[in-house]
């Protein structure tokens, strides 16, 4: 049997990311003998559930079962039957459900209860569905990208396994943008924090990490747009909203009831003399940028330095991975290249936003109009958030890496969440064995 590989003992895990705009199911696998090693877990499948986020099913909870069926059945196909019963399934809900819980704890519990009952019907080892905190979302995103980048590995390599790896053990910061919230997480230079609420301490693989994190609820791209519309309609003279964040010639009717449905627009709510208004795009990046900046209150800061809305932010340090909607939007706009300067990004955004809507529709014929229409706003919002919100500069812009996947695994909180819940990130550095018994005999 010389040089014959023994069959590897493979383990699987499933995490459902119940986001504000949609739900995605991720399947991970790893060799059982190496589960305490760093970088051995990788994603084998992502299944995007058709439809909106679970919070939208609040009035139709009996449809949650069929909504989740296709992706759960896909997991049943991908994972060998012999492994089903020992495969853990976790569902984490993020800011969409945090917002629903703010409106009604009872309704949020009802949705989660039906989700739990639906997921319990499958042959996997269901471990529960819960709303994760913004702090957890930030922390697990940070763990995911650094795990995948090999930053927790004590073995120094003379080669680079991923494009962003600089061969040092300095961790990357994590920038996550969702539909309803955004997170910033990194290891600051100064280990003393002015704000204990934003401080996390980890011991991972024998090393201590003092991490800063904050999650800004209502500052995901979709909720930020609702906020901007609610703010701008306050000063509109009639039911026409001339909006610089949409392409010239774009028109869309918005129901005031939809606008005020979310808790994120409560601060702008007022009695309007109409039930609907029409957005008319004028496509002006500079004006859109100014409008977005009004969502960030920078006039008040009880600390040495703040992001916005009085939230402490230490000086930025090191490289950052920007993922989820940061990546999706910038990738659509073709602005993820390391070579594109911040000035160039701004120039491209000015050009993109000023393009007529009819022209845009022709250029991107395969893209759903609802999504297509919002890229001007989303791109402008990302620039505003990173530059004015988080204080990146033209110089530090080059430290932002827009990342979709690392080594085939999506950047996001789900992998870090599973690694934590399956105890696959040891506090101490595991003793390295010269050969694992799964190699060659």
């Amino acid at each position: 049997t010389q040089n014959k590989a023994l069959p590897e003992n493979i383990k699987y895990g499933i995490v459902l990311d119940a986001g504000s705009s949609h739900t995605s199911l991720y399947i991970y696998k790893w060799p059982a003998e190496k589960e305490n090693d760093t970088g051995v877990v990788h994603q084998v499948e992502e299944c995007r559930v058709k439809g909106p986020g679970i919070s939208k099913y609040v009035q139709k909870v009996n449809e949650i079962g069929i909504y989740l069926t296709d992706c759960m059945e896909r997991a049943r196909e991908v994972i060998p039957r012999s492994q089903h019963q020992e495969t853990p399934v976790y569902l984490g809900a993020t800011a969409g459900m945090r917002l629903l819980r703010m409106e009604s704890e009872e309704l949020a519990d009802r949705v989660l209860d039906v989700v739990e009952r639906s997921l319990s019907n499958y042959p996997f080892d269901f471990q529960g569905a819960r709303i994760i905190t913004g702090q957890e979302e930030g922390a697990y995103g940070w763990i995911t990208i650094n795990y995948l980048l090999g930053k927790f590995s004590q073995k120094t390599r003379w080669f680079s396994i991923v494009p962003y790896e600089t061969n040092n053990q300095e961790t990357f910061g994590a920038l996550d943008l969702g539909g309803a919230s955004t997170q910033i997480t990194f290891v600051p230079q100064n280990q003393t924090t002015e704000s204990p609420d934003n401080a996390l301490q980890f011991r991972l693989y024998g090393k201590d990490y003092n991490v800063y994190t904050h999650s800004f609820l209502c500052y995901g791209k979709d909720q930020a747009l609702w906020q901007k519309l609610a703010k701008d309609i306050q000063v509109a003279s009639n039911e026409i909203l001339r909006d610089p964040c949409f392409h010239p010639g774009y028109k869309k009717v918005v129901n005031v009831s939809d606008l005020y449905k979310t808790p994120c627009t409560k601060r702008f709510e007022m009695t309007l003399p109409f039930q609907q208004f029409e957005i008319q795009g004028i496509g002006n990046y500079q004006q859109c940028h100014q409008s977005v900046l009004e969502l960030f209150n920078t006039s008040y800061c009880p600390y040495s330095q703040c992001a916005f809305n009085g939230i402490f932010l230490p000086p930025l340090q090191g490289d950052f991975g920007a993922f989820s909607a940061f990546y999706f939007v910038m990738n659509f706009l073709n602005l993820t290249s390391e070579k594109v300067s911040q000035e160039k990004v701004t120039e491209m955004m000015k050009k993109f936003c000023s393009q007529p809507w009819e022209e845009i529709k022709t250029s991107y014929a395969g893209v759903k109009e609802k999504y297509l229409s919002e890229y001007c706003f989303s791109g402008t919002y990302i620039l505003s958030l990173l530059l004015q919100g988080y204080h990146f500069t033209a110089d530090s812009w080059e430290h932002i890496h827009f990342i979709g996947k690392i080594q085939g695994s999506d950047a996001g909180w789900t992998l870090g969440y599973m690694l934590n819940l399956t105890n696959m990130i040891p506090a101490e550095q595991p003793l390295s064995t010269p050969l694992s018994h799964s190699t060659y005999v």
Epitope: K50, G51, P52, Y57, K60, D70, V254
Partner: nanobody, 124 residues
Framework: QVQLQESGGGLVQTGRSLRLSCAAS????????MGWYRQAPGNERELVAA???????NYADSVKGRFTISRDNAKNTVYLQMNSLKPEDTAVYYC??????????????????WGQGTQVTVSS
């Protein structure tokens, strides 16, 4: 537009079986989900069984193990095989075809089509 036509309802005794059919016509390519709802007098309409475009199914707890939903894509027809019927299954059964919206505003469903309904009565 999609048109749905149910058939197969009727009066049966407890413990017997019925098979409902729902034939779809029109722009059925916009449809990913098909299912059966029922409404008993004085009650809300409730989802009984549903099937996805991939053929995966889901059932209300009250009918699990007794009812089976299936889909014949070639005939654009969805069926509900109802076995071991009980008096509490008495209701008007509606065929429904729909797809979910991907958006956080407006209605949950992007498309939503209903049949006229067929009466099922289970006598004891």
């Amino acid at each position: 537009q999609v048109q749905l036509q149910e058939s197969g309802g009727g009066l049966v005794q407890t413990g017997r079986s019925l098979r409902l059919s729902c034939a779809a016509s029109g722009d059925i390519f916009s449809i990913n989900y098909m299912g059966w709802y029922r409404q008993a007098p004085g009650n809300e309409r409730e989802l009984v069984a549903a099937i996805t475009g991939r053929g995966n199914t889901n059932y209300a707890d009250s009918v699990k193990g007794r009812f089976t939903i299936s889909r014949d894509n070639a005939k654009n027809t969805v069926y509900l095989q109802m076995n071991s019927l009980k008096p509490e299954d008495t209701a008007v059964y509606y065929c429904n075809a729909w797809d979910y919206s991907d958006y956080d505003e407006g209605p949950l469903r992007e498309y939503d089509y209903w049949g006229q309904g067929t009466q099922v009565t289970v006598s004891s």
